[in-house]
């Protein structure tokens, strides 16, 4: 029997992918593993092999199709398996009845542009990347903006809760350099959580205007 | 090797009771994911209720939800199925099933490794 404390936990970014986490106390570094993907209503499966990320866990990426293709539906149940190679044979280490709108991590936003600066505010704009259809405009974004001085986990959140791809930051420091980030969550699904951060933007706001001599 | 008896099946009314105990011997039941599974006459095997090994989640299918109740006892090493508001739909064989690994599935029955040699439970007035 499998020893130890194990923990399974996969994400479905909505189109083509479903990457996975598996940790288990007490496995060996050097065995071969990997995620199967069985779902139950439709003619294709899928595997990855699973890779280490540290010493007693290991990740991989279901790829099902074309980064945009829509391969599930919130109707489908994929069973997860972990199994790994014993001698010569495979064997199931861990198992989940994987319901992907239920768990969903979409990527994190893409094409981060300054769309007009002045001395105290910027308007940013970005898009979202691999996101299905279904969720027409049912998202919400956070974003963050990095001060001089500052840490990213210091900067305060600014939420929004509607399908806004841009944002328009406010009383700014002149002449000074920043950097912003967004991430963006579906309102559906129990498990589904934020996407990463995305790629910094940075950008400097305008110097202020010299005053003139009297 | 391990080895799963099912009992407490029988005839019951329908909107009546039953709970089935599933006895497992070779092994204990915190290494293995258990398994609920029936089959009705004509139709496929389909997943009822599972718990998971190690951290006891427990998991229904839609069906049974709010009907049936899974449970253990590691002391008596036996899995229970409690099972109310019952329906002639429920008419089936019940398995008790388990799977050296961590996790369970009601989608998939044949990732079980152990099985049970069944116990009818009919719903008939």
């Known amino acids: 029997a499998v020893n130890g404390t194990s923990q399974f936990t996969c994400f479905y970014n909505s189109r083509a992918n479903i990457s996975c986490v598996w940790s288990q106390d007490g496995a060996l570094q050097d065995t071969s593993c990997q995620v199967h993907a069985w779902p139950d209503r439709r003619r294709w499966n899928q595997t990855c092999e699973l890779l280490p990320v540290s010493q007693a866990s290991w990740a991989c990426n279901l790829i099902l199709g074309a980064p945009d293709s829509q391969k599930l539906t919130t109707v489908d149940i994929v069973t997860l398996r972990v199994l790994c190679r014993e001698g010569v044979r495979w064997r199931v280490m861990a198992i989940q009845d994987f319901k992907p709108f239920e768990n969903l991590r979409l990527m994190a936003p893409i094409s981060l542009q300054v769309v007009h600066v002045e001395t105290h505010r910027c308007n940013i704009s970005w898009e979202i990347s691999q996101a299905s259809h279904y969720f027409e405009r049912h998202l919400e974004f956070e974003a963050r903006t990095l001060s001089p001085g500052h840490t990213w986990e210091e900067a305060p959140l600014l939420t929004l809760k509607q399908k806004q791809e841009w944002i328009c930051l406010e009383t700014l420091t002149p002449d000074t350099q920043y950097e912003f980030q967004v991430r963006v969550k579906p309102l559906q699904g129990e498990f589904t959580t934020w996407s990463p951060w995305s790629q910094p933007l940075a950008f400097r706001t305008k110097p202020a205007a010299l005053g003139k001599d009297t | 090797q391990v080895q799963l008896v099912e009992s407490g099946g029988g005839l019951v009314q329908p909107g009546g009771s039953l709970r089935l105990s599933c006895a497992v011997s070779g092994g204990t039941l915190h290494d293995y994911g258990i398994g609920w599974i029936r089959q009705a006459p004509g139709k496929q095997r389909e997943g009822v209720s599972c718990m998971s090994r190690s951290d006891d989640k427990t998991y229904y299918a839609d069906y049974v939800k709010g009907r049936f109740t899974i449970s253990k006892d590691n002391a008596k090493n036996t899995v229970y199925l409690q099972m109310i508001s019952l329906k002639p739909e429920d008419t089936a064989v019940y398995y008790c099933?388990?799977?050296?690994?961590?996790?369970?599935?009601?989608?998939?029955?044949?990732?079980?490794?152990?099985w049970g040699q069944g116990t009818q439970v009919t719903v008939s007035s």
């Open positions: 099933a388990a799977v050296d690994a961590y996790g369970c599935s009601l989608v998939q029955p044949t990732t079980y490794d152990y």
